[in-house]
């Protein structure tokens, strides 16, 4: 009996046309959502003249669909036993899930005047893109409705620059109409261990943002892991919204609708500087923000992002340093509700229930060239949003799922 | 197309005052500041004065500060150079040239100017 | 001040001879260089920004190398039309500073 049923699952997970792992996983049969919330910051002024603590007040949630569309340019390796993929981005508002609407306003940093100065640290430019922050009547912070900045809006600073440039920023600018890969994956048809397993990203099997193996793409997406789970497994997949590979550790037994499954969880320690986890001294870039490598739980992916000062964290700095946290007020870290997890039915490895949490900070420093920057006394690492992206299984699909596998097994 | 063309230099005693002016086509002044550097009779280039886009901002080499004055009329897409109390060592070609990340894209011809009494 | 120091201040130099020039800043400067080619009676023309960026329209055999404080120009196989003055500036601080120049003349 248990022959047949490994037999059986090894045979469905198998990312090949026909399978029920293939199916599921060309289009989603989970619904996907997308919550953000809006760091609203109160003392735009204050912050501005006297580098005061910045005071925000969270507005949400703001909620998307997405995730909804099927996986494109599929094409199946049999030589490498790979199966390669783009996923197509798209976000749907989903108005009765949110606090208000898309032109909702808030007032956040101003992305374009805390970037500029950070990608050009030029005093003569500097002198120039000054003339162009005070032209435009450009500030520190800046009044955005939701859609403009999680979506993109015309830069009226950068409008000013005589170059051909890309002149719309936004938090996600360009999401819709883009595509996330190509990934490149082991469909597990000659080693069941190995499927779903990421062989390669845009074409290349390191991403060259980081030093050493910290550059690794490691593991699955996350959606899937190669089937026959155990706890003591740690389970590693690669995320391209914060650049990296990351590792969720076994932390309990769940009952989901039914079925029993294994979360997974984050630990503290994937975001723990260098002094506390030596693993991570290549996830460590610069020696200034971070006070020499011993500042926590903030990722600097400007490498990912074309230079720009773009931090990763948990919601509200939850496992960062009292360092980060420090210069922003209204902050309030909850492991249940800002941790990442990933609900993992071990038989088949599929992921049935998953939150992702992450922040969006800015790193935004003094530039004595620049008026709207030149009164800062201190660097802030500024959150703008944080969010939560979710899925579970669908009450269908579970008694399906109930019927066919961890009933065949009791 | 993108020129700049210089007119009024000539001959002027010291202590004396020139204007020079720098007329711009295919561009627009303002969107990207305008500099003057000068060249000694056979010597190397020396930058003399910029305006930054928009005209928010003057800046000045040491040796002409306070003497030297540049400035810009956006209607006739033209800047200047206001020179007074020249001195023998003014004495150069001026160029006016477009930036606007610090490096001169277009120059144009030049214009003498000679100090000498 | 930022001193932008050139060697050599000439040289002589044959058709077809690969030739390079050198500029030191008197402090970082990052890649924020730029290099000028002037001939007798003209204006400078721009070659090279941010170090090694060929502007366009220069032929492919100027090159730029360098970053922080020292930094070189090559031309790969000499031409009989680049017999020139070469000058180095930074566009890094204010004020703008050329080095003091590198006549190439013809051997």
């Known amino acids: 009996g248990d022959m047949l049923i490994e037999k059986t699952i090894k045979r469905e997970v198998v990312l090949e046309e026909g399978t029920t792992a293939f199916k599921n996983w060309v289009k989603t049969g989970t619904t996907v959502y997308r919550q953000f919330w809006i760091f609203d910051v109160q003392n735009p002024d204050d912050v501005a003249k006297n580098s005061s603590k910045i005071k925000v007040k969270q507005r949400g949630p703001y909620t998307y669909r997405v995730r909804y569309l099927a996986k494109e340019n599929i094409t199946q390796d049999p030589e490498d036993h790979t199966v390669s993929f783009v996923q197509p981005n798209g976000a749907i508002f989903e108005p009765s899930l949110s606090v208000g609407t898309e032109d909702d306003n808030f007032t956040v940093l101003n992305l374009a005047v805390a970037a500029a100065p950070h990608i050009y640290q030029n005093s003569f430019v500097q002198v120039v893109l000054n003339s162009l922050i005070k032209k435009s009547k450009s500030s520190m912070f800046q009044t955005r409705s939701l859609k403009e900045l999680l979506w993109g809006y015309k830069d009226p600073f950068l409008s000013l620059v005589p170059y051909p440039i890309s002149t719309t920023v936004g938090v996600f600018y360009p999401y819709n109409d883009t595509v996330d890969g190509v990934y490149k994956v082991f469909n597990g048809k000659d080693n069941i261990s190995k499927v779903a397993i990421i062989e390669s990203y845009k074409g290349k099997r390191n991403l060259s943002y980081w030093p050493s193996y910290c550059d690794m793409i490691n593991g699955t997406d996350a959606a899937s892991f190669p089937p026959f789970v155990e706890k003591s497994r740690t389970l590693r997949f690669f995320s391209s919204d914060i650049c990296r590979s990351i590792y969720a550790v076994f932390g309990s037994e769940i009952d989901l609708k039914g079925i029993p499954v294994y979360r997974f969880v984050l630990p503290a320690n994937a975001f723990a500087s260098p002094l506390q986890n030596p693993d991570n001294h290549c996830f460590c870039t610069e020696k200034v923000i971070s006070n020499n490598c011993t500042s926590y739980g903030v990722l600097d992916i400007g490498k990912c992002k074309e230079g720009k000062p773009v931090y990763i964290s948990l919601p509200h700095f939850l496992h960062a340093s009292p360092d980060v946290s420090e210069p922003i007020e209204g902050l309030h870290p909850n492991e249940d509700e800002h941790r990442t997890y990933l609900d993992v039915e071990p038989i088949t490895g599929f992921t049935l229930q998953f939150a992702k949490r992450l922040q969006v900070n800015i790193l935004v420093k003094p530039a004595r060239k620049i008026e709207a920057l030149k009164n800062l006394k201190r660097p802030y690492i500024v959150p703008i949003l944080w969010l939560n992206e979710t899925g579970t299984i669908g009450d269908e699909k579970a008694e399906m799922f109930k019927t066919q596998v961890t009933g065949k097994i009791k | 197309e993108v020129q700049l063309v210089e007119s009024g230099g000539g001959l002027v005693q010291p202590g004396g005052s020139l204007r020079l002016s720098c007329a711009a086509s295919g561009f627009t002044i303002s969107s990207f500041g305008i500099h003057w550097v000068r060249q000694a009779p056979g010597k190397g280039l020396e930058w003399v004065a910029w305006?930054?886009?928009?005209?928010?901002?003057?800046y000045y080499a040491d040796s002409v500060k306070g003497r030297f004055t540049i400035s810009a009329d956006t209607s006739k897409n033209t800047a200047y150079l206001q020179m007074n109390s020249l001195r023998a060592e003014d004495t150069a070609v001026y160029y006016c040239?477009?930036?606007?990340?610090?490096?001169?894209?277009?120059w144009g011809q030049g214009t003498l100017v000679t100090v000498s009494s | 001040d930022i001193q932008m120091t050139q060697s050599p201040s000439s040289l002589s130099a044959s058709v077809g001879d690969r030739v390079t020039i050198t500029c030191r800043a008197s402090?970082?400067?990052?890649?924020?260089v730029a290099w000028y080619q002037q001939k007798p009676g003209k204006a400078p023309k721009l070659l090279i920004s941010?170090?090694?960026s060929l502007y366009s329209g220069v032929p492919s055999r100027f090159s730029g190398s360098g970053s922080g404080t020292d930094f070189t120009l090559t031309i790969s196989s000499l031409q009989p039309e680049d017999f020139a003055t070469y000058y180095c500036?930074?566009?890094?601080?204010?004020?703008?500073?050329f080095g003091q120049g590198t006549k190439v003349e013809i051997k």
């Open positions: 402090q970082d400067v990052s890649n924020w």
């Open positions: 305006i930054a886009p928009y005209g928010g901002y003057t």
């Open positions: 500036q930074q566009h890094s601080n204010l004020p703008l500073t």
């Open positions: 941010y170090a090694n």
């Open positions: 040239a477009r930036s606007f990340f610090g490096y001169f894209d277009y």
